[in-house]
Amino acid sequence: AITEAREEAKPYPLFPGPLPGSLQTDHTSLLSLPHTSGYQPALMFSPTQPGRPYTGNVAIPRVTSAGSKLLPPLAFKHTVGHIILSEHKDVKFNCSISVPNIYQDTTISWWKDGKELLGAHHAITQFYPDDEVTAIIASFSITSVQRSDNGSYICKMKINNEEIVSDPIYIEVQGLPHFTKQPESMNVTRNTAFNLTCQAVGPPEPVNIFWVQNSSRVNEQPEKSPSVLTVPGLTEMAVFSCEAHNDKGLTVSKGVQINIKAIPSPPTEVSIHNSTAHSILISWVPGFDGYSPFRNCSVQVKEVDPLSNGSVMIFNTSASPHMYQIKQLQALANYSIGVSCMNEIGWSAVSPWILASTTEGAPSVAPLNVTVFLNESRDNVDIRWMKPLTKRQAGELVGYRISHVWQSAGISKELLEEVGQNNSRAQISVQVHNATCTVRIAAVTKGGVGPFSDPVKIFIPAHGWVDHAPSSTPAPGNADPVLII
């Protein structure tokens, strides 16, 4: 059952003097009626209590058909004006009105703060008919009130397109202070001032604030809500909270951690994803950011071959993604790689260094002294060359690639041959007579194909010619040789 939950009731002031006869009678007789719900309506006036009708919004009935007697204006009877109660208590309040029986289809609706209360609200309307009038009691109950139930409640009744409105009933739900703004976790610079804000509301007001740092009160005297705490600076992490006090008791905010920004921890797990002759793709796992977002990272690359200079290359990159392709590296070299990242405070230490190697590169020079001549049988072209002076970074020579292009009137075709690294000569079959054969040779390592030599051209005559003089790589700056045989 809903119990009476009135901690304090304040009726609106009532004017002395009797009510107009019929309403006064109705009022008196109403109290003696049984209540179908079984509950005594909250704060009903006793028969001896003086009262007045609400005159702000009344329905004036017309002359009745039975005679010329005017009916009194209709108005809701006065009830309690202000109910104060604690959170989670139950409350019931009502409106009552006596309506002459000449009116049909009267309905009462409840409104809160100007909005009609529809749906699943505990509103009950009871009708008590008599000879001339019907007493109507509209009850509204709230179980376990919350702050959101605070507000001004009124009843409305529509009769003959007229609207009758009751006096408002103010519901004030009081409880422990309720935070509307709590301090927020922050990351702050060491020894730099910052502010924390705390705001709490009642009712009841006032609400007073105490600040707590690491379980100790900061202010001796409370501050009225809202309160801003200026912390002059911290050297180490601290936890702050605020206490909000009112007459109902105390509420403590969440504790918030104030972190001191620091340089980041070094990245970890630097990994090699891919190596080529001149680049290495790495990734890393960022360290702890020191309570300040990463700004960028630095990839440090150090030559570590025993005979290397030890040159250090530093590549700056964005903090995300945690990957970087290191370029401009030497082929077939060993490197030590570390990563460091920075935030607004500074650079982290370098990650643990990892060793990485580049692969063999392609040769950077072409074979030397390429010569081409037609052999005695005239069925083959002999090609000779000298091994190039490849740099060690190119790795081991695995062979040579020979390109020979055959051109005659309307025909041009390129063929490629591969020969082993121990060769310094090759024979190719004549593809077309009365044509020019252009030969180029490139050295090949595991790292790839090097540059081709300058082209050497030889003319392959029609059958019956005799000359076998060779063509050879030109001296630098000369035009491509063409030997007509």
Epitope: P306, N309, G310, V312, S336, W353, R392
Partner: antibody
Framework: QVQLQQPGAELVKPGASVKVSCKAS????????MHWVKQRPGQGLEWIGR????????NYNQKFKGKATLTVDKSSSTAYMQLSSLTSEDSAVYYC???????WGQGTLVTVSA | DIVMTQSPATLSVTPGDRVSLSCRAS??????LNWYQQKSHESPRLLIK???QSISGIPSRFSGSGSGSDFTLSINSVEPEDVGVYYC?????????FGAGTKLELK
């Protein structure tokens, strides 16, 4: 131009320690490995170890571990080699060298004598 | 450790001679080999790196060759100032090791 300056000589007593310095100039100190090499009178060359001033990374010849300790002072662009528990066997010229042995100091003659 | 063996221990030459100094590694070191010249009372001087790469400022009469474990330093036409001790050095793996040296002297 690149210069590696070493004191000409150090005279120390047996059992004592000595810290040989090598002051670098004419290049970025933190860019190259610094090697240390020992040469006993009339003998060949022995590699002691190397240190990288960028991060104090070191590699030692196992033979000299416990005998030599390599350090750097970036603020003065100086590399140091400390030799401990000295005996007559440690009497030698000690060279510092950088850039894949392209540049050498003049050497410091350490004489261990009572 | 890799042992570097140099031969001959001493080489007597006449100015203008072409000479070859040999260096053999106890294991394959690819071309990770340096050659140094050390004159009396001086610091060593790098002549050739990575077996055959010339060094800026070194006279062109000095050249290096070889790969794997056998290496040669050649002096095309010996000059009197070339007198000194020549060392080869393993640069393949730690510890870095030097040969005992070849002493070049004038006849």
């Amino acid at each position: 131009q690149v210069q590696l300056q070493q004191p000409g000589a150090e005279l120390v007593k047996p059992g004592a320690s000595v810290k040989v310095s090598c002051k670098a100039s004419g290049y970025t100190f933190t860019s190259y490995w610094m090697h240390w090499v020992k040469q006993r009178p009339g003998q060949g060359l022995e590699w002691i170890g190397r240190i990288h001033p960028f991060d104090s990374d070191t590699n030692y010849n196992q033979k000299f571990k416990g005998k030599a300790t390599l350090t750097v002072d970036k603020s003065s662009s100086t590399a140091y080699m400390q030799l401990s528990s000295l005996t007559s066997e440690d009497s030698a010229v000690y060279y510092c060298s950088i850039a894949g042995f392209a540049y050498w100091g003049q050497g410091t003659l350490v004489t261990v004598s009572a | 450790d890799i042992v570097m063996t140099q031969s001959p221990a001493t080489l007597s030459v006449t100015p203008g001679d072409r000479v070859s100094l040999s260096c053999r590694a106890s294991q394959i070191i690819s071309d990770y080999l340096n050659w140094y010249q050390q004159k009396s009372h001086e610091s060593p001087r790098l002549l050739i790196k990575y077996a055959s790469q010339s060094i800026s400022g070194i006279p062109s009469r000095f050249s290096g060759s070889g790969s794997g474990s056998d290496f040669t330093l050649s002096i095309n036409s010996v000059e009197p100032e070339d007198v000194g001790v020549y060392y080869c050095q393993n640069g393949h793996s730690f510890p870095l090791t030097f040969g005992a040296g070849t002493k070049l002297e004038l006849k």
